[in-house]
């Protein structure tokens, strides 16, 4: 049991208040982390609070001003990148988003040297993505959806590429569907250790049919976006991997990197790239049917100028059982003798653990083992090995960092952050310098997030970077909810929840309970981290219980858990949540009158069919952004899970699992459907069906749409949204405002 | 021994058709963009077209988009360019070149296409 | 498209003497895009000096490549009998690639 401390003694009752809404709607009390930039072994860079960038060495203690904040604000500049060589800095303004990693920007070269702002052969402008080489001062950029090089920054740039269209081809970037669902990141290039080599995606959209919706804006005519997005069944985008020599790039030109022959001989996608030397490349490949990863280890042939990929260095990985990998298929992380490497995948029991792989997959050998799992590695340097899991005391939503001896025999293994402020942090994440000389911890909670250096070869805390004193010092007069994390045993089932009581909570009252479902594949609500969020108003400030409970489908607790959900999604993730109900109201403390169910995205799915259920047991509920059917949803994640929606495949599921067909369920509950117009990722039609299908059934509902709105339904529509859904709430259970 | 042979010129009427081909050999055909360079009789040199090593990007010179085609046989280290709708102005010697947009540092003899009526 | 201007057009020196031809850019290529081709009568073009300013495999040393931004030098430091013929010089930083006019070194 976590339980946050409320802070209340009776003599000071009086001086405590409730958190208000008000408080979450402007951020009250949120909390800062403090990832330093390493630029070396010892130094790192940090923006402090006046802007300026700021340089820091560990070893002698010394910091400097780099970049005054003048000079940011000369061009309004909101990011930087310092150059390898230290040279240079870019200073990136005009920051406009694009989709969930993408942006564009503008960029501006400062020479540290002189300085000054490097003029003559300017950037253009926007930019959708610039770097460093990783040695020296190169810089790749994305422009126009081409890339390109320059040698150092006051140099003409090398275009790389020619065929960049809007919307049809992609250089050096994801198009929508990679950059959500397979990269998770803005980018698709990769420099080689030196920089000697430039690694780059092409996507290619051109036969993807196009989602579009209106943008209303403020014109007399909406304008249309269009977006080339797979769903389910459609055609994919094409990707093709191209390395060129950064020295002399004009003359070999891009050469293609080959696909294995299992991967090309049906529809596939690229996963990700990892470079291992100026020579060795790592591509990772996967079939359309998501349950086959190939791993190839490509090597540059100097004698031939050619990038050779020997079936000798292809690794196959493959799930009998569900998808491969996780969310995604892990990546590498290379060992210093540049061609065997570390990887979290399943073992022999289904939990996914370390293993080290030195010559075939079959021949790994597994380096964590155990009945939870291994989540991270974060570095392996000569003799030690890094990672993050959640074995300690088998808490499932922990995350504590060890420490693998590699370099002795047997490895030893440690925990670093199992016993350090053990009731404030029990989930961390770490940040490394080069060579993993020191290094950052991050602790999300429960407590209070705390930022904190360390010596790598001893892990001996050095200092505080960041602990939130601020905050510690706002909450002392709140009244708190407390919050408590426990499992449930049902048909050899464990469903962790994490619950959230009222500060002054009595077992022998009767409490309305607000279930908060997310529930997707691999996904985990119930964490022990440190949050003061809307959930946590409505236990503080209008007495509701809350509660989060992790069912099938859900990671990090083995892949029976996590794989039962395959090929069937919106079955066991809705039992489950209806299961922990039960036993919630069996405990003796809930208004079994007064229970509602609400989620965002994968969980406004859950918390429909939860709705749509027909137990009886939910008064109401909220659906925010939902998903209604797989057929509306991208191709990459949901045939991850659900394979094909074709009549040899899972087509029968498919049509079983939309909301719009249990619609007549939806009469005997209080139903708000809430959704952004101009979502990208679950569209508006998700939400437009669903509402088609309720009024073609004459069943009652409440809806609210937010124009032009993303999934993220940010700024203003934020505060109306949660105004919104705490009315709703409070009429359900009646509550008085 | 790095080789570069090119063949296929001659006589062609305008709007006529040729392909030139250009049979390579002594270095890994595969790995290289390659290149078609043409002079205009007494003229300097003028790139018309480049094709990458695995052959799925292709470059042209505005004077040839829509009428020229460069493609590459991989299995048998052979560059192509067919030569459509020709005109007075294309008549010139055409050399194969080893190179993407610069470098060329192997050449083949060059064949002539001349252009007439 | 990026012009380049080669000056002399036609140079004319002795054998032993040293030569010197100059490449004009419109825009700015840098050297690491620039190449010299050598080329004589009925013959393939031959390159001399590879992007970068690298000497070509096989050719002597007294053939040397300089400049940057948008002026380049080709040196030949003693005139061979065999020099004699057209220079080009040829830029790749940009689609499409394009070459100088040629400079003529004839005997004089």
């Known amino acids: 049991i976590v339980l946050r401390p409320s802070r209340v003694h009776n003599s000071e009752e009086n001086t405590m208040r409730a958190l208000t809404l008000k408080d979450i709607l402007n951020g009250t009390f949120s909390y800062k982390t403090f990832f330093p930039n390493w630029i070396s072994g010892q130094e790192y860079l940090h923006q402090s609070a006046d802007n300026n960038i700021v340089l820091y060495n560990i070893e002698t203690g010394q910091s400097y001003t780099i970049l005054s904040n003048r000079t940011m604000k000369s061009v309004n500049a909101s990011n930087y990148g310092l150059s390898p060589d230290r040279q240079f800095v870019y200073l990136e303004s005009d920051y406009s988003k694009l989709w969930r990693y993408s942006y564009t920007a503008t960029y501006y070269i400062y020479d540290l040297s002189n300085g000054e702002f490097v003029r003559g052969n300017e950037l253009p402008r926007p930019i959708q993505y610039l770097c460093w080489s990783p040695v020296g001062s190169k810089l790749a950029y994305v422009y126009q959806n081409n890339i390109y090089l320059k040698q150092r920054p006051g140099d003409p740039p090398f275009q790389i590429t020619f065929n960049g269209r809007e919307n049809k081809i992609f250089n050096g970037i994801p198009d929508w569907v990679y950059e959500e669902e397979m990269l998770a990141t803005k980018y698709a290039l990769w420099w080689s250790p030196n920089g000697k080599f430039l690694a780059y995606a092409e996507f290619n959209d051109t036969d993807i049919p196009v989602i579009a919706y209106s943008y209303y804006g403020d014109e007399q005519y909406p304008r249309t976006i269009n977006i080339p997005y797979p769903k389910a069944g459609a055609k994919n985008p094409v990707v093709r991997i191209f390395i060129i020599d950064t020295t002399y790039p004009a003359y070999v030109g891009p050469q293609e990197v080959p696909v294995p022959a299992m991967i090309a001989s049906s529809d596939y996608y690229f996963s990700w790239l990892t470079w291992v030397t100026d020579e060795r490349v790592c591509l990772q490949w996967l079939k359309r049917v998501q349950n086959v990863s190939v791993l190839s280890i490509c090597d540059f042939r100097e004698d031939w100028q050619t990038w050779d990929c020997p079936k000798t260095q292809e690794h196959i990985e493959e799930s009998r059982t569900g998808w491969a990998g996780g969310f995604f298929v892990s990546t590498p992380v290379f060992s210093y003798d540049a061609i065997s490497y570390y990887k979290i995948f399943s073992d022999k029991d289904g939990y996914k653990h370390i293993h080290y792989i030195k010559d075939t997959v079959e021949n790994a050998i597994q380096i964590t083992s155990g009945k939870w799992e291994a989540i991270n590695i974060f570095r392996v340097t000569q003799d030690s090995l890094f990672y993050s899991s959640n074995e300690f005391e088998e808490y499932p939503g922990r995350r504590n960092i060890y420490r693998i001896s590699i370099g002795s025999y047997p490895p030893s293994k440690k925990c670093v952050t199992c016993h350090l402020r053990k009731e404030r942090c029990q989930y961390y994440t770490a940040s490394f310098s080069d060579y993993a000389k020191y290094y950052a911890l991050v602790c999300y909670g429960p407590g209070i997030p705390i930022s904190t250096l360390h010596d790598g070869r001893t892990d001996q805390e050095i200092k505080i970077l960041e602990e939130n004193k601020e905050l510690e010092n706002a909450l002392k007069n709140i009244q708190l909810p407390k919050e408590e994390i426990k499992k449930l045993e049902v048909d050899e089932i464990t469903l962790w929840y994490k619950m959230i009581l009222p500060p002054q909570f009595d077992r022998s009252k009767k409490y309305p309970l607000l279930i908060q479902v997310y529930g997707g594949p691999c996904s985990q609500s119930v964490r022990s981290v440190f949050a003061v969020n809307w959930i946590s108003y409505l236990a503080s400030k209008e007495g509701m219980v809350i509660a989060l409970v992790d069912g099938r489908g859900t990671a990090f607790q083995g892949d029976k858990l996590l794989y039962a959900v395959y090929r069937k999604l919106g079955v066991y993730e809705v039992e489950d949540q209806i299961t922990a109900v039960r036993k919630f109201i069996e405990m003796g403390f809930i208004d079994e009158k007064r229970i509602a169910i609400w989620g965002w995205s994968y969980g406004g799915y859950v918390s429909s069919l939860a709705l749509a259920s027909g137990t009886g047991l939910f008064k109401c509920g909220i659906a925010v952004a939902p998903v209604s059917s797989w057929e509306y949803y991208a191709s990459v994640y949901t045939e991850r899970f659900m394979g094909l929606p074709t009549k040899d495949d899972n087509l029968e599921h498919y049509k079983n699992s939309t909301v719009m067909a249990r619609a007549e369920y939806f009469r005997n509950v209080d139903y708000l459907l809430i959704h952004g117009t101009a979502d990208d990722n679950v569209h508006f039609q998700n939400s437009a069906q669903i509402a088609k299908a309720l009024v073609n059934a004459q069943v009652d509902f409440q809806a609210m749409w937010y124009s032009d709105q993303n999934h993220g339904l940010s700024g203003l529509s934020t505060n109306h949204l949660y105004t919104h859904m705490t009315h709703f709430l409070k009429q359900c259970f009646s509550l008085s405002d | 021994e790095v080789q570069l042979l090119e063949s296929g010129g001659g006589l062609v009427q305008p709007g006529g058709s040729l392909r030139l081909s250009c049979a390579a050999s002594?270095?890994?055909?595969?790995?290289?963009?390659m290149s078609w360079v043409r002079q205009a009789p007494g003229k300097g040199l003028e790139w018309v077209s480049a094709?990458?090593?695995?052959?799925?990007?292709?470059y042209y010179a505005d004077s040839v988009k829509g009428r020229f085609t460069i493609s590459r046989d991989n299995s048998k280290n052979t560059l192509y360019l067919q030569m459509n709708s020709l005109r007075a102005e294309d008549t010139a010697v055409y050399y194969c070149a080893k190179g993407w947009f610069g470098g060329f540092n192997y050449w083949g003899q060059g064949t002539l296409v001349t252009v007439s009526s | 498209e990026i012009v380049l201007t080669q000056s002399p057009g036609t140079l004319s020196l002795s054998p032993g003497e040293r030569a010197t031809l100059s490449c004009r850019a419109s825009q700015s290529v840098t050297s690491s895009y620039l190449a010299w081709y050598q080329q004589k009568p009925g013959q393939a073009p031959r390159l001399l000096i590879n992007v970068g300013s690298r000497r070509a495999t096989g050719i002597p040393d007294r053939f040397s490549g300089s400049g940057s931004g948008t002026d380049f030098t080709l040196t030949i430091s003693r005139l061979e009998p065999e020099d004699f013929a057209v220079y080009y010089c040829?830029?790749?930083?940009?689609?499409?690639?394009?070459f100088g006019q040629g400079t003529k070194v004839e005997i004089k």
């Open positions: 094709i990458i090593g695995s052959g799925s990007i292709t």
């Open positions: 040829q830029q790749g930083i940009m689609l499409p690639p394009t």
């Open positions: 002594g270095f890994t055909f595969s790995s290289y963009a």
